[in-house]
Structures are given as structure tokens and as C-alpha cells.
């Protein structure tokens, strides 16, 4: 017996399989900044982490995912204001007792040097110089991302 979430996931995959080639994002939309193969959008208001996550989705994007220290540094170089904090797509999973990205992967402990505790209701923010653990209810700005690399879905014959 599949859960409703699993059913939904299967339905989405099936509809994807029937889709012909879907071109990816080749250029960043207006107002977005390009950083390598990503487009970034910095908010101009403040929100708790979950509202920030939801707001990025209204822009057909996600909270920022950072692959490694190099990408972190390049992102921080785009931040012009010293004291401003931005949510990214990383929070503490209580069940797994680990930092978890919103795409389901876990943080490689070498990637980010986090200041603060790893505990329940903690989410990760970045500033121009550092990475912080904050209460997810803290109201700060956030960064959305879109992937620039073209996405092409294979065409599968109907089975």
C-alpha cells in the first residue's frame, strides 16, 4: 500500500516520462543574478525559515543549496551588506540528528563551518563572512535559487 506522497511521486514521474524534451533555463530571468550554473534571487523582506522556503517556491525556485566551500565563498561575495543574514535550504533533522538539505541530502561536515548549535528547530543562515545556526523562527532575509543547466527529460515509450 503506497502512501499518498509516494503515489503523488509516482504520478509525477509517469507524467514526466510522457513529456517530450523540456528545455532548461538557459539564462537567468530578469532580477536574478547568475552565479556559475545557478541563478540567485535575494529577498528584500524578512521571514522565518519555513515562510522563506514557501516563498521561493512561488518563484518556481528553492532555497539556496550550497555544494561546497568554494560555492559558499562565491555566494558570500555577492552579499553587499556586512550584518545581514540570509536563510539557505539547510535545517536540522531531529529524527536523523544531522543537518539536512531540502533536497534530502545530508551536510558533508567539511563543507560549512557552522557557528552555533545543531539542535531541534535550528536552520542555517549565511552572512558575508560566516555560516550560522539560528532558530528557524528568526525573521531574516533569504536566497532563492534556480538551476541554469538545461534539463532534458528522456522520452520513454508507454508500457
Amino acid at each position: 500500500q503506497k502512501s499518498s506522497i509516494e503515489k503523488c511521486s509516482v504520478d509525477i514521474q509517469q507524467s514526466r516520462n510522457k513529456t517530450t524534451e523540456r528545455p532548461g533555463l538557459l539564462n537567468c530571468p530578469i532580477y536574478w543574478q547568475q552565479l556559475r550554473e545557478k541563478c540567485l534571487l535575494f529577498s528584500h523582506t524578512v521571514n522565518p525559515w519555513n515562510n522563506s522556503l514557501a516563498d521561493c517556491s512561488t518563484k518556481e525556485s528553492s532555497l539556496l543549496l550550497i555544494r561546497d566551500k568554494d560555492e559558499l565563498i562565491h555566494t558570500q561575495n555577492l552579499i553587499r551588506d556586512k550584518a545581514i543574514l540570509f536563510w539557505i535550504g539547510l535545517n536540522f533533522s531531529l529524527s536523523e540528528k544531522n543537518w539536512k538539505w531540502i533536497n534530502g541530502s545530508f551536510l558533508n561536515s567539511n563543507d560549512l563551518e557552522i557557528r552555533g548549535d545543531a539542535k531541534e528547530n535550528s536552520c542555517i543562515s549565511i552572512s558575508q563572512t560566516s555560516v550560522y545556526s539560528e532558530y528557524c523562527s528568526t525573521e531574516i532575509r533569504w536566497i532563492c535559487q534556480k538551476e541554469l543547466t538545461p534539463v532534458r527529460n528522456k522520452v520513454y515509450p508507454d508500457s
Epitope: 530578469i30 532580477y31 534571487l41 535575494f42 529577498s43 528584500h44 523582506t45 524578512v46 521571514n47 522565518p48 515562510n51 516563498d55 518563484k59 553587499r80 551588506d81 545581514i84 525573521e139 531574516i140 532575509r141 532563492c144
Partner: antibody, heavy 120, light 107 residues
């Protein structure tokens, strides 16, 4: 149509506080961030800070951080700006202004302004 | 803080004239510049966002251009209702700042 209606003019003594209100109509109040901007007589515009009516989160211009408090009452679609320890150079017209987009810093609708005079 | 310097501070012109107002930023602000019009005793009114994008309902005689540190607002053919003070604003940083204004008067 979008309207921001502010409270009436105030005269205050130095050291006192003033609280200005801004009642929004014609749109979903919690859907747009509210900002406060002031204009001293014959001067330019100065941004004071913002409040997200949805969450209540605020961010203030460092210049006013110790003296300003921005709040809101979602039940009556009203934002408030309180400025304490008033000085004569706080004499200005205070405007509420709606942020047009969560990801850009422009103000698409403004209140009519509230004149605050600080005089002994 | 990013300083915005508008020039000229005062401008006299006639109905039908083409006028240009300049806004210079002390640092690169990309395209994050806004233009407002303000009439005496009234609140500012949004004209242009992102250096060149006209707000809905703004007449096509208003146009904006520029990027980086130099921006212009052009009114192609002045109408009587255009005599007002114009302000630029930047939002490249989160401390939003405004120019000192350009007062456009009837010659």
C-alpha cells in the same frame, strides 16, 4: 484600489514618543511588506525600516534602531511606526510605503503622509 | 552607505521640451534604481523600477536608462502635470538611499 491612509498630524515635545498608523485597503495586507520613509522640511527622503505584516518580522535602518518600533494589527490591516526620544530634527512628514515585491526594493504605493512636529 | 547625487538640483523647462535628469551612485548598484515623482504636499509616486521598467499606468514619455553608477530619467515631451520634484532611489544594498531630488519648474 490600493489605499494607505495614515493618522493625522502630531505635535510633540522633545523626549516624547509618537505613534503613526497606516491603514491598508484594496489588497491583502499580509501579502506585502510595509516600509516607513520620512521627509524633513525641504529635504530628501530617508528610509527608516520595514515590517512584514504576515510574520511581524522587522528590519530597521541602523540610524533609528534604538528609537523605532514597527508593529502591525492584521485584524484591522494597519501598520504602526513608533519613534521615541523625539528631537527637533525628527520634525518631518512620515510616510508608510508598500514594498512592491518581496525581491525588489521599490515602493509602489504610499500613504498621504503624517506631519510630526517636535517643538518645545 | 551608497550616496546618490542628482543633477541638476533645479531645472527650468517649457511644455513640450525634452528633459533629462541624472542620478550618480557612489558605488556600482547594478540596475537596482527607482525613480519617483513628487508634487508639493503629496506622497512620491513610482515611475520606474530596475532602472528602465515603467510602472503600470506611467505615460510612455517617461523613460529610464543606465546601469552601474550612472542613471538617467528622460521626459520626452514635457506636459503641464510633469512639473514636480523627481527622486532616484537605490536598493542594491539593504540600506535604501535616495537622491537629493531634482525640482522641475516651468520656465
Amino acid at each position: 484600489q490600493v489605499q494607505l491612509v495614515q493618522s493625522g498630524a502630531e505635535v510633540k515635545k522633545p523626549g516624547a514618543s509618537v505613534k503613526v498608523s497606516c491603514k491598508a485597503s484594496g489588497y491583502t495586507f499580509t501579502g506585502y511588506t510595509m516600509n516607513w520613509v520620512r521627509q524633513a522640511p525641504g529635504q530628501g527622503l530617508e528610509w527608516m525600516g520595514l515590517i512584514n505584516p504576515s510574520s511581524g518580522g522587522t528590519y530597521y535602518n541602523q540610524k533609528f534602531k534604538d528609537r523605532v518600533t514597527m508593529t502591525r494589527d492584521t485584524s484591522i490591516s494597519t501598520a504602526y511606526m513608533e519613534l521615541s526620544r523625539l528631537r527637533s530634527d525628527d520634525t518631518a512628514v512620515y510616510y508608510c510605503a508598500r514594498l512592491g515585491d518581496n525581491y525588489r526594493g521599490y515602493f509602489d504605493y504610499w500613504g498621504q503622509g503624517t506631519t510630526v512636529t517636535v517643538s518645545s | 552607505d551608497i550616496q546618490l547625487t542628482q543633477s541638476p538640483s533645479f531645472l527650468s523647462a517649457s511644455v513640450g521640451d525634452r528633459v533629462t535628469i541624472t542620478c550618480r551612485a557612489s558605488q556600482d548598484v547594478g540596475s537596482a534604481v527607482v525613480w519617483y515623482q513628487q508634487k508639493p504636499g503629496k506622497a512620491p509616486k513610482l515611475l520606474i523600477d530596475w532602472a528602465s521598467i515603467r510602472h503600470s499606468g506611467v505615460p510612455s514619455r517617461f523613460s529610464g536608462s543606465g546601469s552601474g553608477t550612472e542613471f538617467t530619467l528622460t521626459i520626452s515631451s514635457l506636459q503641464p502635470e510633469d512639473f514636480a520634484t523627481y527622486y532616484c532611489q537605490q536598493y542594491s544594498t539593504y540600506l535604501y538611499t535616495f537622491g537629493g531630488g531634482t525640482k522641475l519648474e516651468i520656465k
